[in-house]
Interface confidence: low
Amino acid sequence: APRGTQAEESPFVGNPGNITGARGLTGTLRCQLQVQGEPPEVHWLRDGQILELADSTQTQVPLGEDEQDDWIVVSQLRITSLQLSDTGQYQCLVFLGHQTFVSQPGYVGLEGLPYFLEEPEDRTVAANTPFNLSCQAQGPPEPVDLLWLQDAVPLATAPGHGPQRSLHVPGLNKTSSFSCEAHNAKGVTTSRTATITVLPQQPRNLHLVSRQPTELEVAWTPGLSGIYPLTHCTLQAVLSDDGMGIQAGEPDPPEEPLTSQASVPPHQLRLGSLHPHTPYHIRVACTSSQGPSSWTHWLPVETPEGVPLGPPENISATRNGSQAFVHWQEPRAPLQGTLLGYRLAYQGQDTPEVLMDIGLRQEVTLELQGDGSVSNLTVCVAAYTAAGDGPWSLPVPLEAWRPGQAQPVHQLVKEPSTPAFSWPWW
């Protein structure tokens, strides 16, 4: 710190006093000097460091009519809302000619009720799950001892005997309040009261019970929920593209999920109105009167394939002698899976039914046995997926080919000598 020289007497006729008070106090430090000639600018030091942004005012009063006469200079430093950072040794400093003069020191101290640097915060925790709360207070005067309270009941016999800055709670089964008291020689300050809301634990073991093409039955194990019974569980399902990238930690799915509520128990739910042969991701959360648990991680599931829901459309069957030409279009109804092909069955009035697998073609030419005199020949077609056959079309009678009708050339399919198996006729 700058030092005054001994060559000249100090100009200070009034030195800063002392201030001791509680946080938030407003006070003023003053120093006064008498100088000859032009009044100097007064600076303030705290602990030897110049206060560049000090809230100070300077008043100058001439003691004579001549500018070279003596002046009284008063500098006042205002401290608003006293904080710990304001404490220390204060001095005034002036430059007079080539000399530096420093006043005698004054002291600013802080003493009062404890002040909280950190208080317990409201939070939600899962039932029976450890967590910790923080509380930190300081004086002066030190020491500051803390006493934690749960639901207004002290957790130790006396301040300073229990947990101090951090309270470890091994788990709660009901929503509780926590606060801490800070004690020092001046008295007691009480922190805010934090409400710790006990939510159900995250459900576990989310799994599939059964699968249908348009519905999935899922079950899970509920977590503990403390003294609060679960009111319901909420299940979300979302279509999962290959690139959607739902991962365990990802907070939200990319599109609006399908949400269903399940009353509990049982901890089971049938999710309907799903697309067949489609991958989904599902998750579940359970709710008590205190609020919902966290979601489980997303679980990838898939609906199985179903059979086509309708028969092939626009079936036409024409006959020319010993050949029959049949063609059709894909079913308009949902296929519920990957179309693997078509089955065709034909039968005459007094002949056994013949069943054929046509594959994915939508037309076929049949080579009929005999002289073509089989009467009342009818044809039915069904589409199939890996899950099985869809419904058969209504029997379509074979119409005689009329000259002028185009007869496309098609690969001939020989009728098998005996049916592979019999199909119920309509």
Epitope: N128, P130, N132, H168, P170, G171, L224, Q247, A248, G249
Partner: antibody, heavy 117, light 107 residues
């Protein structure tokens, strides 16, 4: 001074059983959740079980679920691990440890379990 | 299960050096990460919990940092007695899982 001392390890045949104990001192045992952790011969650490301070809640990983049972006697300040249907992959050094903000702040010196025919 | 990956099985350093041991979680573990030191022939000892809180009695040359999935244990000035295996552990979700360990060797 916090002290945890495991015992009960040894050589056992596959399918056999063993009961480990962990005697504790130097802290209020009934205030703390406790763990069993094992360290394989390859030095890999695996959490085996944990139990709440009152003993009402226990948790196990799938690797030991249904075969191992953690328990405690707060009057005796002792933690136990009953191991049954032991497999060769259960061969390890078994440590008991005290829970501190979900981390393990004090560990015992360990007891060795060898499952071999 | 959450997988904790310590990509360096071994790290070689000299006394006085600064060294950082890393650990990556397979998902966000919200700073619920602890670090342990295991010296030869001893049981593991807790160094850091909640990613950055130093356990009682641990020298201040050990610091922990990180968030989300990436965590680091830093020894600001390695001492000869720091020769040990260092493990990370997530205590975010059961089953609590450990990294496979990083062996710190002194040159």
């Amino acid at each position: 001074e916090v002290n945890l001392v495991e015992s009960g390890g040894g050589l056992v045949q596959p399918g056999g059983s063993l009961k480990l104990s962990c005697a504790t001192s130097g802290f209020t045992f009934s205030d703390y959740y406790m763990y069993w952790v094992r360290q394989t011969p390859e030095k890999r650490l695996e959490w085996v079980a944990y139990i709440s301070n009152g003993g009402g809640s226990t948790y196990y990983p799938d690797t030991v679920k249904g075969r191992f049972t953690i328990s405690r006697d707060n009057a005796k300040n002792t933690l136990y691990l009953q191991m049954s249907r032991l497999k060769s992959e259960d061969t390890a050094m078994y440590y008991c440890a005290r829970l501190h903000f979900y981390a393990m702040d004090y560990w015992g010196q360990g007891t060795s379990v060898t499952v071999s025919s | 299960d959450i997988v904790m990956t310590q990509s360096h099985k071994f790290m070689s350093t000299s006394v006085g050096d600064r060294v950082s041991i890393t650990c990556k979680a397979s998902q966000d573990v919200s700073t619920a990460v602890a670090w342990y030191q295991q010296k030869p022939g001893q049981s593991p000892k807790l160094l850091i919990y909640w990613a950055s809180t130093r356990h009682t009695g641990v020298p201040d040359r050990f610091t922990g940092s990180g968030s989300g999935t990436d965590y680091t244990l830093t020894i600001s000035s390695v001492q000869a007695e720091d020769l040990a295996l260092y493990y990370c552990q997530q205590h975010y979700n059961t089953p609590f899982t450990f990294g496979s360990g990083t062996k710190l060797e002194i040159k």
